[in-house]
């Protein structure tokens, strides 16, 4: 199984052909990119809770920590993607790990990210054995940082 | 220009014609993907400076500020990548948004994303009007965070 | 052909725990997902929660605290467990395959149901 | 979180009617089911990522909409058609399988 970039089909980015009524075991191989986010999943308890760890994962020991909600769509590549949900409006004080400081806020990063979506080719013959890949801009929430509040002008 | 789905070809994912001795500008136009980094680039002086700013970007404003850095490859998909670069070792305080804390971190998140690679196609007839596209995952450090330092067990 | 049953205790006293289990035929847990759907008396279907293939599971954001899906792929079982229970969680409760493939694309459409348990909570 | 609303919420045709129920979605949809549920039985699957037909289904149902606004037609009406009809959404983050209200169709 390829992809192939080829003239001569007017959707961008593709059009391919599957094997009807199967599920497409090279699809899924190709599809399935990272399926981790980029730290560990942590399903202890303190990667759910307000307040920054002295181990574990970055997302849990930051003083704006986050955690990891799964965002999964077969017909997508990459399936899985990740969005960091943060635990906490104001950031964590390093002094205690637990009590927040109304000083700085605990805000998302996003990022728009290129993804394929896999779609049906419209107006081409076979379209039972025809798929179309359509890349978009899709907006994820990488971490969650802590910033100084911004002060309007 | 389209991607498509092919038996017959080894390369995962993708094998793919091109247009000999040109420049492949609908190659160009699929593969720019975004070329912005999660935040609009700060071209002031703060955003390249040990400090919290209190206006601009996000990146400037964390307390574990950091600039970006292009990484752009013509053959890959996307073609430009930003990477994250801590501009202070540990986190600045909330309170003076410039005095180090030595209580924090700023260390650098990072993620494999998934990538292509434009590729020649070897084994194939006609492999100066091919290439391939070759899934890969690829590290990137998507933001810097303030942590509180590991405590080792 | 493709069947899902599910079994439950029938009647929870209130604030107490309910199990429903889910044995499913006809095609393999690995390959699709399940969700759990509940419907009130003469109300409509609300969704509870879905466990994929690989055993990646979600959940009704509301429910999510009380709410515990898992699965024996070997058994061809899937277990709902719900915690708390009050006099509102009175209702039927399905389970229902999710995800086939066309030829096409994927669809998350639930194309299978069992026949729904019947869940009565009260003193 | 996304809101399906379905409208009406009870309607009544003769048999060889037209009838067309519709489902409002408070934001954009990109995957978009119809159910049918007979008393005392399972929500049955009729219309898979509007407007495919499910396996069995007769062609007298039709489904049609994109974005917020979606229906369900039913070209003919038969007494067998008598029933209750849900559409239902999903989406992957935050990941949500979610039910309208419901239509009740009484075949007069």
């Known amino acids: 199984v390829s992809l192939r970039i080829q003239e001569g089909c007017s959707h961008l980015p593709s059009c391919c052909p599957s094997k009807e009524q199967e599920p497409p075991e090279e699809w899924l191989k190709w599809s399935s990119a990272s399926v981790s986010p980029p730290e560990p999943l942590s399903h202890t308890h303190h990667a759910e809770s307000c307040r920054a760890s002295k181990d574990g994962p970055l997302n849990s020991r930051a003083i704006s920590p986050w955690s990891y909600e799964l965002d999964r769509d077969l017909n997508r590549v990459p399936q899985d993607l990740y969005h960091a949900r943060c635990l906490c409006p104001h950031c964590v004080s390093l002094q205690t790990g637990s009590h927040m400081d109304p000083l700085g806020n605990s805000v998302p990063l996003y990022h728009n990210q290129t993804v394929f979506y896999r779609r049906p080719c419209h107006g081409e013959e076979g379209t039972h054995r025809r798929y179309c890949l359509e890349r978009r801009l899709y907006r994820v929430s990488l971490a969650c940082v802590c910033v100084r509040p911004r002060v309007m002008a | 220009v389209s991607l498509r789905i092919q038996e017959g070809c080894s390369h995962l994912p993708s094998c793919c014609p091109s247009k000999e001795q040109e420049p492949p500008e609908e190659w160009l136009k699929w593969s720019s993907a975004s070329v912005s980094p999660p935040e609009p680039l700060s071209h002031t002086h703060h955003a390249e400076s040990c400090r919290a700013s209190k206006d601009g970007p996000l990146n400037s404003r964390a307390i574990s500020p950091w600039s970006y850095e292009l990484d752009r490859d013509l053959n890959r998909v996307p073609q430009d990548l930003y990477h994250a670069r801590c501009l202070c070792p540990h986190c600045v305080s909330l309170q003076t948004g410039s005095h180090m804390d030595p209580l924090g971190n700023s260390v650098p998140l990072y993620h494999n994303q998934t990538v292509f690679y434009r590729r020649p196609c070897h084994g194939e007839e006609g492999t100066h009007r091919r290439y391939c596209l070759e899934r890969r995952l690829y590290r990137v450090s998507l933001a810097c965070v303030c942590v509180r330092p590991r405590v080792m067990a | 052909q493709v069947q899902l049953k599910e079994s439950g205790p029938g009647l929870v006293a209130p604030s107490q725990s309910l199990s429903i289990t889910c044995t499913v035929s006809g095609f393999s847990l690995t390959d699709y997902g399940i969700n759990w759907v509940r419907q009130p008396p003469g109300k409509g279907l609300e969704w509870l929660g879905m466990?994929?293939?690989?055993?990646?599971?979600h959940y009704n954001s509301v429910l999510k605290s009380r709410l515990s899906i898992s699965k024996d792929n070997s058994m061809s079982q899937i277990f709902l467990k719900m915690n708390s229970l009050q006099t509102d969680d009175t209702a039927r409760y399905y389970c229902?395959?999710?995800?086939?493939?066309?030829?096409?694309?994927?669809?998350?459409?639930?194309?299978?149901w069992g026949q729904g348990t019947s869940v009565t909570v009260s003193s | 979180q996304i809101v399906l609303t379905q409208s009406p919420a009870t309607m009544s045709a003769s048999p060889g009617e037209k009838v067309t129920m519709t489902c409002s979605a408070s934001?954009?949809?990109?995957?978009m089911y119809w159910y049918q549920q007979k008393t005392g039985s399972s929500p049955r699957l009729l219309i898979y990522d509007t407007p495919n037909l499910a396996s069995g289904v007769p062609v007298r149902f039709s489904g049609s909409g994109s974005g917020t606004s979606y229906s369900l037609t039913i070209s003919r009406v038969e007494a067998e058609d008598a029933a209750t009809y849900y559409c239902q959404q999903w989406s992957s983050y935050p990941h949500t399988w979610t039910f309208g209200g419901g239509t009740k169709l009484e075949i007069k």
């Open positions: 466990i994929w293939g690989d055993g990646v599971t």
């Open positions: 229902a395959r999710t995800l086939f493939y066309d030829g096409t694309l994927y669809y998350y459409a639930m194309d299978y």
């Open positions: 934001s954009s949809v990109t995957y």
